[in-house]
Amino acid sequence: SEVEYRAEVGQNAYLPCFYTPAAPGNLVPVCWGKGACPVFECGNVVLRTDERDVNYWTSRYWLNGDFRKGDVSLTIENVTLADSGIYCCRIQIPGIMNDEKFNLKLVIK
């Protein structure tokens, strides 16, 4: 089952997600999506990175940590009740079925 995280209406929510780059700066693509992780990629994408940078994001969603060191934790700004639900963090490690998938449940009070 999903790990549960809580935040209050109007505050920022923090959803942790980490990986260890094979070497400094040797990044892998990561996507964040609203909804449980599907078979591949992320549905309802709110943010994604490639091998170099954040290449897609939507308002209120950002990475506060140093994603170049593998901290791809998601911050959601000024949350509302509509932000409740499951979020997918997917670390897209190259290879055959190597992706790491994390489903995180956000509860807004």
Partner: antibody
């Protein structure tokens, strides 16, 4: 226009392998995932797996793990599906199908299909 | 594995009538991850609906999709002669990707 052209029909003996190709044209090959789906005579659709044509991500259906290999050649915009240890139950039409997830679109759906390759397994 | 059960297996209707096809999932599927396809004899499937309710490019507006959770519906508001075919639902939510067994829509 966007199209997928597959290799021709194959007849194989049980225990043999078959390699089906799927050549893409009309779009940026490395921007879209490619599925392989098969359909036995008179039956429904069965998903076999998916490859990211950049070649860095492959997912196989558990049923086919160990027997299926999906590869790609970006120089010719072609994906391949090889199925080994063939048995009579593998007789089917094999389709490649592009998933339209990508290029800023984050929904899923197999929007372009090859014409299908008939593989017959018979002794 | 998520099992998709389509009903009815065969639907016999006349042109001009309304068709309602059902797809029930063995466990909840996000609506973002559900699609519908049409297949005619000797042809590859054609994407009709993605995200449970969005029409694919070039699909007439007589086709519509709805539903959430475990119950999804494809509706054809007024059947045209070219609509008689087999229809499949499909889910992307959990590996393996699965299809329903199909509903055959035939002319009455």
């Amino acid at each position: 226009q966007v199209q997928l052209v597959q290799s021709g029909a194959e007849v194989k003996k049980p225990g043999a392998s078959v390699k089906v190709s799927c050549k893409a044209s009309g779009y940026t090959f490395t921007s879209y995932y490619m599925h392989w789906v098969r359909q036995a005579p008179g039956q429904g659709l069965e998903w076999m797996g998916i490859i990211n044509p950049r070649g860095d991500s492959i997912i196989y259906a558990q049923k086919f793990q160990g027997r299926v290999t999906m590869t790609r050649d970006t120089s010719t915009s072609t994906v391949y599906m090889e199925l080994s240890s063939l048995r009579s139950e593998d007789t089917a039409v094999y389709y490649c199908a592009r998933d339209f997830y990508g290029s800023g679109n984050y929904y899923y759906g197999m929007d372009v299909w090859g014409q299908g390759t008939t593989v017959t397994v018979s002794s | 594995e998520i099992v998709l059960t389509q009903s009815p297996g065969t639907l016999s209707l006349s042109p001009g009538e309304r068709a309602t096809l059902s797809c029930r999932a063995s466990q909840s599927v996000s609506s973002s991850y559900l699609a519908w396809y049409q297949q005619k004899p000797g042809q590859a499937p054609r994407l009709l609906i993605y995200g449970a309710s969005s029409r694919a490019t070039g699909i007439p507006d007589r086709f519509s999709g709805s539903g959430s959770g475990t119950d999804f519906t494809l509706t054809i508001s007024r059947l045209e002669p070219e609509d008689f075919a087999v229809y499949y639902c499909q889910q992307y939510g959990s590996s393996p990707i699965t299809f329903g067994q199909g509903t055959r829509l035939e002319i009455k």
